[in-house]
């Protein structure tokens, strides 16, 4: 009786279980009662990452430098190319089809997490006692200067955008 289901790494065709082509190869001819499945290896620019019965290999992803992309990991016959973004850029989406510049944290905000090739800068507001007076993709909030440790006094209070201004203590005669 012809099979209705096949084992893993096989497929059913013409009431027969045929071996799937291994990753990195595509299907040329189905098996028969007398012959094995015929598979053909993919070329250097192509891949198939599963046991399959595809008649065409997939083209490797192209990391387009005009879109800010570069190759993070070269594809093989069994894996696709992995793209990442050039320095200062990150992927627009999970599929990383193009890149955008990292955002900068405005004055009053500091960098909580520096951007990577796949994630944007994460900013946080500077809490009391800290400030940031620059727009930057790298700088964290910096602590206000401690006037006391310099034997000075606060002449002007700090904000989230400005440091405190220290000055000499008033000398009593």
């Amino acid at each position: 009786e012809p099979p209705t289901a096949c084992r893993e790494k096989q497929y059913l065709i013409n009431s027969q279980c045929c071996s799937l082509c291994q990753p990195g190869q595509k299907l040329v001819s189905d098996c028969t009662e007398f012959t094995e499945t015929e598979c053909l290896p993919c070329s250097e620019s192509e891949f198939l990452d599963t046991w399959n019965r595809e008649t065409r290999c997939h083209q490797h992803k192209y990391c387009d430098p005009n879109l800010g992309l570069r190759v993070q990991q070269k594809g093989t016959s069994e894996t696709d190319t992995i793209c990442t973004c050039e320095e200062g850029l990150h992927c627009m989406s999970e599929s990383c089809e193009s890149c955008v510049p990292h955002r900068s944290c405005l004055p009053g905000f500091g960098v909580k997490q520096i951007a990577t090739g796949v994630s944007d800068t994460i900013c946080e507001p500077c809490p009391v006692g800290f400030f940031s007076n620059v727009s930057s993709a790298f700088e964290k909030c910096r602590p206000w200067t401690s006037c006391e440790t310099k034997d000075l006094v606060v002449q002007q209070a700090g904000t989230n955008k400005t440091d405190v201004v220290c000055g000499p203590q008033d000398r009593q005669r």
């Epitope: 299907l27 040329v28 001819s29 028969t32 094995e36 053909l40 290896p41 070329s43 008649t55 065409r56």
Partner: antibody, heavy 118, light 108 residues
């Protein structure tokens, strides 16, 4: 007995096209892909490509894209290699070959000699 | 593409002599995908050894093959007159499929 019978020798002028045939017999034609190989003095053996006789999908060596076209006629169990815009560089012996389960080329046609000359 | 370099290109041997032909691949290939063919003048190539070391049907036991990775070889333990031919290695590991340039073995 498995046989791959190729068409006869061709003497053609530069710039024209030629179509070489390969008729399979002694087996079910659509059970095996048909490969084509070029043999010239300069370059030894070169794989042109393969056509799936059942699905009709051809895969080419990049070097022969635009030069070679593979096709099949299932009703006559015949595979074809068409070569376009011929030059003296195309002068060679062309073989069709079929795989068994051991290697891609267990069975070969007798070869078709193509001479391109003005 | 994978380039297969055969050596020597031409050699001559006396009957009874041991012959070794080497085939070096430009990148590593699975031993399942390396084959050897024999071709005599005026004839089509004929499968000699498949998957590195398996003799094709009807091939005499004096022929053997070995190798792995990028280095493969074909050996004739004792040359006979009928072995005068051109030998080609061939890879099926990556498209485009490629052949070595051939080793012409002549009888001394």
């Amino acid at each position: 007995e498995v046989q791959l019978q190729q068409s006869g020798a061709e003497l053609v002028s530069p710039g024209v096209s030629v179509k070489i045939s390969c008729k399979g017999s002694g087996y079910t034609f659509t059970d095996h892909g048909m490969h084509w190989v070029k043999q010239s003095h300069a370059k030894s053996l070169e794989w042109i490509g393969v056509i799936s006789t059942s699905y009709g999908v051809a895969t080419y060596n990049q070097k022969f894209k635009g030069k070679a076209t593979l096709s099949v006629d299932k009703s006559s169990s015949t595979a074809y290699l068409e070569l376009a815009r011929l030059t003296s560089e195309d002068s060679a012996i062309y073989y069709c070959a079929r795989r068994d389960s051991k290697s891609p080329f267990d069975y070969w046609g007798q070869g078709t000699t193509l001479t391109v000359s003005s | 593409q994978i380039v297969l370099t055969q050596s020597p290109a031409i050699m001559s041997a006396s009957p009874g002599e041991k012959i070794t032909i080497t085939c070096s691949a430009s990148s590593s290939i699975s031993s399942n995908y390396l084959h050897w063919y024999q071709q005599k003048p005026g004839f089509s190539p004929k499968l000699l050894i498949y998957r590195t070391s398996n003799l094709a049907s009807g091939v005499p036991a004096r022929f053997s093959g070995s190798g792995s990775g990028t280095s493969y070889s074909l050996t004739i333990s004792s040359m006979e007159a009928e072995d005068a031919a051109t030998y080609y290695c061939h890879q099926y590991h990556r498209s485009p499929l490629t052949f070595g340039a051939g080793t012409k073995l002549e009888l001394k």
